[in-house]
């Protein structure tokens, strides 16, 4: 048993069936010391009585806020949540494996520049009687601070008879470097409750790898004279990191018919112009990476041709 | 060329060469995530290597005010990484063939510690751990990490030059 | 894209010779490693070897050594293997193949087989 | 040269059956295997590489694992068109080697 903060503690359960439990003690937060008595939730029935009560938590009907009175009066709480362990393997029932970009991914994040600021977001199908809590560092044997916002409900999405509720959290490193290189990944935990549930869930990663420039900006055309060719110009997207001759982002355009199934023209540049052929119907897009790491491309910023 | 008076190194050079390295890197380990490196013990690996850091003078504003500092950081790496791709690590099993990246990355990190240091001058370089692991899979996993490790480097070195080349170039 | 085509089909006597071929397109022909396998009928694949065209040298798995040569046109992007003292024992598909760009010797790349037939 | 042990030499399964197939080196080779699959009269085509990797355009039904000299690909749910010859092969030792091949068949 371990606290997860002032009077909520967690109880670390083998979870089979007939598995013993955990034998736990609470201690009534209290000076008194006779006339004690303790229940359980709502419940008025008297589970024990003095300053101490052992109990044996086996199972979710064991666990919830036990209370000590005494003579009407409450004195102390202690809410016991249950954190199971299945073969050896913690539960993983409150958030959704995303499988991206690996099985077994639940927290994804990303970054829009090197400036140690960072998002990062988790779905679940639980809608009520759930809470997040979110801690971060740089590095865990002597961590570095990252300060994280709380949790919130970002999006909510029908996928066929279930809703799915995504949450994200924004964090930003203390004393971020964006020109070093980085030795030590960040770490984030994130704790999750529903109702008498406690999991947690952990991501380790490097800035550079998670980086995902916003879209280029401000695309436009310029047909040239006597000419199918049109000049494309976009500029670096306000939330890339600067100096952009030491930050820079390599880009590529892409002519893409209306149809999915026409052939895709593609050029790769690190300038912020390309000439290409526009075709009748078709629309032209930009996307921008990180021209010396391969992290993610950003998405497209689209014009049509006409 | 950084000569002992500290002169300006050739930045276009070192951007071109620089920016042929990330390409290289890339090419010679080009999955983020098909293992997670850091899953599989970290012990004696990849710690030892310079890491460019936030004192080290890479960063616009210590470019501007002394790039020596910086320069020598990335010197000491390039010589620390040519001496690792040159080791049995790479050249053990799992067997490269000789089409591999591995062979023009080693050679061009040696031609950009050359750019930057010419013959009869010394910067101080780092001692490389004396690893040489027995089995094919700890000498994969280290190459792994080690080329990783690579192209976070570079990335930060291809930044300096490309800056130097666009603001310090005479 | 990158293609890589074989010459047609050939029925050889025991004892004879056979050279085939495989025409590459779709990259530069020097800057990779071009493989030889073979599948026996009804069998698996064996490696054979393969040429670097940059600096044209052959590395060949020893139990075809004296069997086989490897070599490269770089005039044409062609690579060409040659099976010398042929037996009923060489009737398979051959196979040419290029790996990936990481310098390991998986096969992404496939000629579509050349079935040479040692008949008497 | 590296033996590559592998089994079954032929497997009859229904469509969307978990299937497995086995490959055993005789000494490590990492991760240093790869998975082809082989159509009747066709080329062998890449599934797998770095004994878990998919290969672009592979269904993710096909997955890899296993490393040092014990390797397995799975098909999650077998669909009509996986019919085929399937080879592990490890690149991690020269002379390159191959398993004998699994035949795969639909009941």
């Known amino acids: 048993i371990w606290e997860l903060k002032k009077d909520v503690y967690v109880v670390e359960l083998d979870w089979y069936p007939d598995a013993p439990g955990e034998m736990v003690v609470l201690t009534c937060d209290t000076p008194e010391e006779d006339g004690i008595t303790w229940t359980l939730d709502q419940s008025s029935e008297v589970l024990g009585s003095g300053k101490t009560l052992t109990i044996q938590v086996k199972e979710f009907g064991d666990a919830g806020q036990y209370t000590c009175h005494k003579g009407g009066e409450v004195l102390s709480h202690s809410l016991l949540l249950l954190h199971k362990k299945e073969d050896g393997i913690w539960s993983t029932d409150i958030l959704k494996d995303q499988k991206e970009p690996k099985n077994k991914t639940f927290l994804r994040c990303e970054a829009k520049n090197y400036s140690g600021r960072f998002t990062c977001w988790w779905l679940t199908t639980i809608s009520t009687d759930l809470t997040f809590s979110v801690k971060s560092s740089r590095g865990s044997s002597d961590p570095q601070g990252v300060t994280c916002g709380a949790a919130t409900l970002s999006a909510e999405r029908v996928r066929g008879d279930n809703k799915e509720y995504e949450y994200s959290v924004e964090c930003q490193e203390d004393s971020a470097c964006p020109a070093a290189e980085e030795s030590l990944p960040i770490e984030v935990m994130v704790d999750a409750v529903h109702k008498l549930k406690y999991e947690n869930y952990t991501s380790s990663f490097f800035i550079r790898d998670i980086i995902k420039p916003d879209p280029p900006k401000n695309l436009q055309l310029k047909p040239l004279k006597n000419s199918r060719q049109v000049e494309v110009s976009w500029e670096y997207p306000d939330t890339w990191s600067t100096p952009h001759s030491y930050f820079s982002l390599t880009f590529c355009v892409q002519v893409q018919g209306k149809s999915k199934r026409e052939k895709k023209d593609r050029v790769f540049t690190d300038k912020t112009s390309a000439t290409v052929i526009c075709r009748k119907n078709a629309s032209i897009s930009v996307r921008a990476q990180d021209r010396y790491y391969s992290s993610s491309w950003s998405e497209w910023a689209s014009v049509p041709c006409s | 060329r950084a000569v002992p008076g500290g002169s300006s190194p050739a930045w276009t050079q070192c951007q071109q060469l620089s920016q042929k390295l990330c390409t290289l890197a890339w090419s010679a380990h080009p999955l983020v995530g098909h293992m997670d490196l850091r899953e599989e013990g970290d012990e004696e690996t990849t710690n030892d290597v310079p890491h460019i850091q936030c004192g080290d003078g890479c960063d616009p504003q210590g470019l501007r005010d002394n790039s020596q500092f910086c320069l020598q950081r990335i010197h000491q790496g390039l010589i620390f990484y040519e001496k690792l791709l040159g080791s049995d690590i790479f050249t053990g099993e799992p067997s490269l063939l000789p089409d591999s990246p591995v062979g023009q990355l080693h050679a061009s990190l040696l031609g950009l510690s050359q750019l930057l240091q010419p013959e009869g001058h010394h910067w101080e370089t780092q001692q490389i751990p004396s690893l040489s692991p027995s089995q094919p899979w700890q000498r994969l996993l280290l190459r792994f990490k080690i080329l990783r490790s690579l192209q976070a480097f570079v990335a930060v070195a291809a930044r300096v030059f490309a800056h130097g080349a666009a603001t310090l170039s005479p | 894209q990158v293609q890589l085509v074989q010459s047609g089909a050939e029925v050889k006597k025991p004892g004879s010779s056979v050279k085939v071929s495989c025409k590459a397109s779709g990259y530069t022909f020097t800057d990779q490693t071009i493989h030889w396998m073979r599948q026996a009928p009804g069998q698996g694949l064996e490696w054979i070897g393969y040429i670097y065209p940059r600096d044209d040298s052959p590395k060949y798995n020893e139990n075809f050594k004296g069997k086989v040569t490897i070599t490269a046109d770089i005039s044409t992007s062609t690579a060409y293997m040659e099976l010398s003292s042929l037996r009923s024992e060489d009737t398979a598909v051959y196979y040419c193949a290029i790996p990936d760009r990481s310098g390991y010797a998986w096969f992404i790349y496939w000629g579509q087989g050349t079935l040479v037939t040692v008949s008497s | 040269d590296i033996q590559m042990t592998q089994s079954p030499s032929s497997l009859s399964a229904s469509v969307g059956d978990r299937v497995t197939i086995t490959c055993k080196a005789s000494?490590?080779?990492?991760?240093?295997v790869a998975w082809y699959q082989q159509k009747p009269g066709k080329v062998p085509k890449l599934l797998i590489y770095w004994a878990s990797t998919r290969h672009t355009g592979v269904p993710s039904r096909f997955s890899g694992s296993g490393s040092r000299t014990d390797f397995t690909l799975t098909i999650s749910s077998l669909q009509p068109e996986d019919v085929a010859d399937y080879f592990c092969h490890q690149y991690s030792s020269y002379p390159f080697t191959f398993g004998s091949g699994t035949k795969l068949e639909i009941k």
């Open positions: 000494r490590d080779v990492a991760i240093a």
